[in-house]
């Protein structure tokens, strides 16, 4: 499904396309276009992928670009104002809405742009704790590629006063090379905490070939979240976890 | 501070159509879905169903040629209706914010929650 | 649909007890998982959402915690006011279900 509508609403109910009016060909001036995309229902997310062939005015996105925000509406959180020839990265919502701004000015036309909405799928469940005093955690399919569009929560738990060291044996995502305005791993990447995910302190966030070397955690609870984008899979990661313990009253579950 | 006040007939005979009314006061309205739970006597908790301040509906799969949630912005209020009863739907309706946004991004949990009201269904 | 498991159903503590409920999910939902406190002839309370985070004014004696199909509930040291039943809720997929109820009652 295709529309090329100046704004719409849309409730998903199989992945489409929405594009700027007249996209491949010279968008309109003085053209404002919104689209509501909506999830069925409060548990989906929605992801968006901007086709490569991504052309607007590029004059610090004074003139013409495209917005994203992540809610109902401009008050939804605010996720990237775009303009050039770079297109730019996936965008997954929060929630079940995302409100998409094009908005061109009188002069100075480009080719537009296109974009691919879809549920923001999990793939397959990949999801794991860990209790034993050592293990071995591998990204999906290892060391096939990788699937799409995951995110995966791994969760190392030990007793307290017992230190987990988490050494990567074979490291490869999808390279971020040139990254805007500081951030970094933006397609695929493992953010590491010690603790639990967004609650503990935040270890690192990788991807690339570079391996994160050997992790260190003292909490009793080492995290790791992989996320995958919709696109360019690569083999993922294998790694090794052990446990020093500190106090050996406590016993593994 | 977020409070929902529910209120409905408490007594119905089978066949009949249950019909309540959860009113919200404080907050935002637009922001969240808004939904219906039951609890039957001394059982566990049953999402019905939840709605949008535009309208858009989700039901329970379980109920949903039953239940109808509608919705008036205008009051930030929103009703159930769940058709042609039986005595198994003898229970306490609670109305409750469910997922929506706030501060800190899109949230998944039912908070807070109306008071609840005792439907019988009896003949 | 989603089926939440709880254990145990009744568990019998005193005051100062360290609680713990567990709660299982028949397929992964990530983290997210919530846990409610409801007393009789009151509507459910929310403790816990996201699996680990504290709710603003519930006391920090309550902790949650996992990810994926296995979560617990704990209550580090009882305290008279906890005498209730607790729920878990999965808010990872519709429709949202909850868990069959842990009753924890006086030893």
């Known amino acids: 499904f295709r529309n090329d509508k100046c704004g719409d609403t849309i409730k998903i109910e199989s992945p489409g396309y929405l594009t700027s009016p007249g996209y491949p060909h010279s968008y309109h001036p003085s053209e404002k276009c919104e689209w509501l995309i909506q999830a069925p229902d409060p548990y989906q997310r929605i992801m968006i992928n901007f086709n490569p062939h991504f052309d607007l005015e590029d004059r610090d996105c004074k003139y013409d670009y495209v917005e994203v925000f992540d809610g109902e509406n401009e008050n939804g959180h605010f996720r990237g104002k775009f303009c050039g020839k770079i297109a730019p990265p996936p965008v997954v919502s929060s929630g079940p809405f995302l409100f998409i701004k094009f908005v061109s000015d009188y002069e100075t036309h480009g080719a537009g742009f296109s974009i691919r909405y879809e549920i923001f799928k999990r793939g397959p469940e990949c999801s794991q704790n860990y209790t034993t005093p050592s293990g071995v955690i591998k990204s999906p399919g290892f060391p096939e590629k990788y699937p799409n569009s995951l995110e995966c929560t791994y969760i190392v738990f030990v007793p307290k006063m017992s230190e987990i060291i988490l050494e990567f044996e074979s490291f490869d995502l999808e390279p971020d090379s040139n990254p805007p305005g500081g951030m970094f791993c933006r397609y695929d990447r493992l953010e590491i905490w010690d603790g639990f995910p967004d609650v503990g302190p935040h270890i690192g966030r990788y991807c690339g070939q570079k391996t994160p070397g050997r992790i260190r955690s003292s909490s009793g609870i080492l995290s790791m979240v992989f996320y995958t984008d919709s696109a360019i899979a690569k083999e993922g990661f294998s790694a090794n976890y052990s446990v020093l313990q500190s106090s050996v009253s406590e016993d593994f579950k | 501070q977020v409070q929902l006040q529910q209120w409905g007939a408490g007594l119905l005979k089978p066949s009949e159509t249950l019909s309540l009314t959860c009113a919200v006061y404080?907050?935002?309205?637009?922001?969240?879905?808004w939904s219906w739970i039951r609890q039957p006597p001394g059982k566990g908790l049953e999402w019905i169903g939840d709605?949008?301040?535009?309208?858009?509906?989700n039901y329970n799969p379980s109920l949903k040629s039953r239940v109808t949630i509608s919705v008036d912005t205008s009051k930030n209020q929103f009703s159930l209706k769940l058709s042609s009863v039986t005595a198994a739907d003898t229970a306490v309706y609670y109305c409750a914010r469910g997922p929506g946004y706030d501060s800190s991004g899109y949230s998944r949990r039912f908070d807070p929650w109306g008071q609840g009201t005792l439907v019988t269904v009896s003949s | 649909d989603i089926q939440m498991t709880q254990s145990p159903s009744t568990l019998s503590a005193s005051v100062g007890d360290r609680v713990t409920i567990t709660c299982r999910a028949s397929?992964?939902?990530?983290?997210?998982l919530a846990w409610y406190q409801q007393k009789p002839g009151k509507a459910p309370k929310l403790l816990i959402y996201?699996?680990?985070s504290l709710e603003s004014g519930v006391p920090s004696r309550f902790s949650g915690s996992g990810s994926g199909t296995e979560f617990t509930l704990t209550i580090s040291s009882l305290q008279p006011d906890d005498f209730a039943t607790y729920y878990c809720q999965q808010l990872n997929s519709y429709p949202p279900t909850f868990g069959g109820g842990t009753k924890v009652e006086i030893k």
């Open positions: 397929q992964s939902i990530s983290s997210w």
């Open positions: 709605i949008w301040h535009s309208g858009m509906t």
């Open positions: 404080g907050g935002s309205f637009v922001k969240y879905y």
């Open positions: 996201k699996a680990s």
